[in-house]
Interface confidence: low
């Protein structure tokens, strides 16, 4: 028998520094978790102590904090190199700054293989990117070899900016020939490492012949055996065992997100490369694990540039940006309009000539807007200003919802109107009219939404049975502020970009902004 220890991370999203328990900014260091310095301590302890160790990342290192905004992926390459990762799969967010924003800072700088078997380059990009990422890699581990084959969500063109010269194929179709190739090379221990979400991970385990272990990401899935050590509720046992179509027991793992846990999976193989046993658990990287002093010193050195950046001007406003609770929790506010416009702009993807864009709608809980920005400071807007407006470190995500779910959400928005509660929705690509004289649950009298399958966008009545794409804060996607119907009824959920980053990018692009209150939200006469 031969033992392999797989250490794995996924969806780290730029959490290079330690964070609070909810993965936002660390406030009380004695209660903080994660970060690359602490991760390094644990990884080194395990490497020193166990003979055959692989450290793998299943994608989405990019995007999530000011670290990515400023360093644009150079920080990912630098610190992953320092931690001596053995391999990484490409996630959808690795394409957020386009293909160039992946090639230059990461692909060319990484000292470890970066993998995806289902991304095929074409046209002039094919020669430029050749060899910079691979479908698979054979890694020597002790006196054995292990094959790692990568995969990436085929939805990436809708979620990020990979451009037109990368084709995202079906994961299972693309993986099988690469696994077959590994078998012909006498590699009999194969890990599928990728970023397509837990449901696809399970399908790969079931359908791809020859895959022994699946290490996944994208869905931020937390698996645990026994009593979980923090707030995350397990979606199943760790590892999650899938019976493949050819009768093998295939362990599937994921390690939540944000570098809060280090996935720890021990696999025992027989001499033919069959998995005899698999077991483990994610390790909570809490303050009982010290931060490595040398990595911490490096983090502090890199931090200096971030502090300078946060006070630099991103753009200007020539109007007062009303983010007050007196406005945003009661009526349409121009800060809400600005944020929603930025959210839609961040999701412009011309992937189909029948559609001007794949998504036109935004909703945003008014309670998530925490501060106004005064234009009388020379109009200057800084990252620091935006951090006061959006202090929670959330993401703006893409969901698919039925029209009937959206209708319920808008009824919830005003079900207890007038009490300055956070659920009042700000919008983009939506015109809503409320009649507050009607009873709660029946106050939405008009709900029109901007078409997507049209050359000239216009507003049409919401159809209850139609499926719509909507951009919204992850807080709402997870049922926050009482929007349980969104959590329970959503048909798809893909996590998006850091909220502040979305708005800052938009402001930088526009240079000068002047959002207005323009009749997106109305109250029918006599009721308000």
């Amino acid at each position: 028998a031969w033992e392999l220890t797989i250490l794995h991370t996924n969806d780290v999203h730029s959490r290079l520094e330690q964070t609070s328990e909810d993965s936002s900014k660390c406030v009380n260091a004695s209660r903080c978790m994660g970060g690359v310095a602490r991760l390094f301590t644990k990884v080194q302890q395990i490497r020193r102590a166990e003979p055959n160790v692989l450290l793998l990342d299943a994608g989405d290192q990019y995007q999530g904090t000011i670290w990515f905004t400023v360093y644009k992926g150079a920080e990912v390459a630098h610190f992953m190199n320092a931690l001596r990762y053995d391999a990484m799969a490409l996630g959808n967010h690795e394409f957020d700054n386009g293909v160039e924003g992946l090639i230059e800072p990461l692909l060319k700088e990484a000292k470890f293989p970066i993998l995806s078997a289902n991304i095929k380059a074409k046209g002039p990009l094919a020669s430029q990117i050749s060899g910079l990422y691979l479908p698979y890699k054979v890694l020597p581990v002790g006196d054995e070899v292990v094959g790692i084959v990568g995969y990436t969500s085929k939805e990436t063109p809708f979620l990020s900016n990979p451009g037109t010269n990368l084709v995202f194929e079906d994961e299972i179709t693309a993986l099988q020939p690469e696994v077959d190739k590994l078998k012909t090379l006498n590699v009999n221990k194969i890990i599928a490492l990728g970023h397509s979400g837990f449901e696809m991970d399970k399908l790969i385990a079931q359908k791809v012949r020859g895959v022994d272990v699946v290490v996944g990401g994208h869905s931020n899935t937390f698996l645990y055996t026994g009593n979980p050590p923090s707030k995350e509720v397990p979606a199943g046992k760790y590892p999650f065992i899938v019976t493949s179509d050819d009768g093998r027991k295939v362990p599937v793992v994921q390690a939540y997100a944000f570098g809060k846990y280090l996935g720890y999976l021990k696999i025992e193989f027989d001499e033919r490369g069959n998995v005899i046993s698999s077991h483990g658990n994610p390790i909570l990287l809490n303050s009982s694990i010290p931060e490595d002093p040398s990595i911490k010193a490096d983090i502090n050195k890199w931090r200096i540039k971030l502090d300078n950046y946060s006070t630099q001007e991103l753009g200007k406003t020539i109007v007062y940006l009303d983010g007050s609770s007196q406005s945003c929790r009661f009526r349409e506010c121009n800060m809400g309009n600005l944020i929603c416009d930025a959210m839609i702009n961040n999701n412009l993807r011309h992937t189909d000539e029948m559609f001007w864009n794949h998504v036109s709608m935004c909703i945003l809980n008014g309670g998530g807007i925490r501060s106004p920005i005064d234009e009388r400071n020379n109009g200057t807007i800084t990252w620091e200003n935006l951090a006061a407006v959006l202090p929670f470190g959330g993401t703006f995500d893409l969901v698919q919802l039925k029209g009937s779910t959206l209708k319920k959400a808008f009824e919830h928005s005003v079900h207890r109107y007038g009490q300055s509660t956070g659920e009042f929705l700000q919008v983009g690509g939506i015109h809503v009219v409320y009649d507050l004289s009607r009873k709660p649950g029946d106050r939405v009298v008009k709900l029109d939404v901007l078409c997507t399958k049209c050359r000239v966008p216009s507003y049409d009545p919401l159809k209850m049975d139609e499926v719509y794409k909507v951009i919204l804060p992850n807080f709402l996607a997870n049922g926050g502020d009482g929007f349980q119907m969104i959590k329970d009824e959503l048909l798809r959920h893909d996590s998006g970009d850091q909220d502040i980053n979305v708005v800052s990018t938009y402001i930088s692009k526009m240079k000068v902004i002047y959002p207005a209150v323009e009749g997106r939200i109305k109250f029918s006469t006599g009721s308000h």
Epitope: Q45, A49, P51, G226, K266, H279
Partner: antibody, heavy 119, light 107 residues
């Protein structure tokens, strides 16, 4: 402080079985391995096998595969080793010891249970 | 199975002495070696893991070294409480195997 609690002694008849316990309070039981080690009087240490409390996955020394069966009860944070078809060769002190993430050093040991096989 | 050999089964030394206990493996074990101390009352403690890393709470007079197949444990300044039997153990491959032990006595 991690303490593994084992009963002091067991007296059993030849041919019978005995189930030894190892109670492990004071830490997340399901995140670690429990190892079992045999020591015959005046002899050295011999690794019998181990069990991962989180999933009941186990490894055995081939020599003990038909002799020992390892189990856990997570509700009571207790590991068990059943020894079957006992002979005088099985008279020994049996230790349980914890190992876990990041080092397979047996970091914490029980006091050991002395098993005497005698008619 | 990997055989672990401690050629010296017993060793006599004086208080304050520097004592070295050796251990060899039947094949290379890439530093995957631990040292344990067993007191006369049967109590067992981990002293050193991964050849040279001191387990928490273990006095700094204990140190370990070695590579490949040959390893050693050194006690730099022998104290009365160090009277015990010392075992090496490899964890490079299953099954885990121990050396036969070296019993340390006071002259």
């Amino acid at each position: 402080q991690v303490q593994l609690q084992q009963p002091g002694a067991e007296l059993v008849k030849p041919g019978a079985s005995v189930k030894l316990s190892c109670k492990a309070p004071g830490y997340t039981f399901t995140s670690y391995w429990i190892n079992w080690v045999k020591q015959r009087p005046g002899q050295g240490l011999e690794w019998i096998g181990n069990i991962y409390a989180g999933s009941s996955s186990s490894n055995y020394n081939e020599k003990f595969k038909s002799k020992a069966t390892l189990t856990v009860d997570t509700s009571s944070s207790t590991a068990y080793m059943q020894l079957s078809s006992l002979t005088s060769d099985d008279s020994a002190v049996y230790y349980c010891a914890r190992s876990g993430h990041g080092y397979d050093g047996f970091a914490y040991w029980g006091q050991g249970t002395l098993v005497t096989v005698s008619a | 199975d990997i055989q672990m050999t401690q050629t010296t089964s017993s060793l006599s030394a004086s208080l304050g002495d520097r004592v070295t206990i050796s251990c060899s493996a039947s094949q290379g074990i890439s530093n995957y070696l631990n040292w344990y101390q067993q007191k006369p009352d049967g109590t067992v403690k981990l002293l050193i893991y991964y050849t040279s890393s001191l387990h928490s709470g273990v006095p700094s007079r204990f140190s370990g070294s070695g590579s490949g197949t040959d390893y050693s444990l050194t006690i730099s300044n022998l104290e009365p409480e160090d009277i015990a039997t010392y075992y090496c153990q490899q964890y490079s491959k299953l099954p885990r195997t121990f050396g036969g032990g070296t019993k340390l006595e006071i002259k």
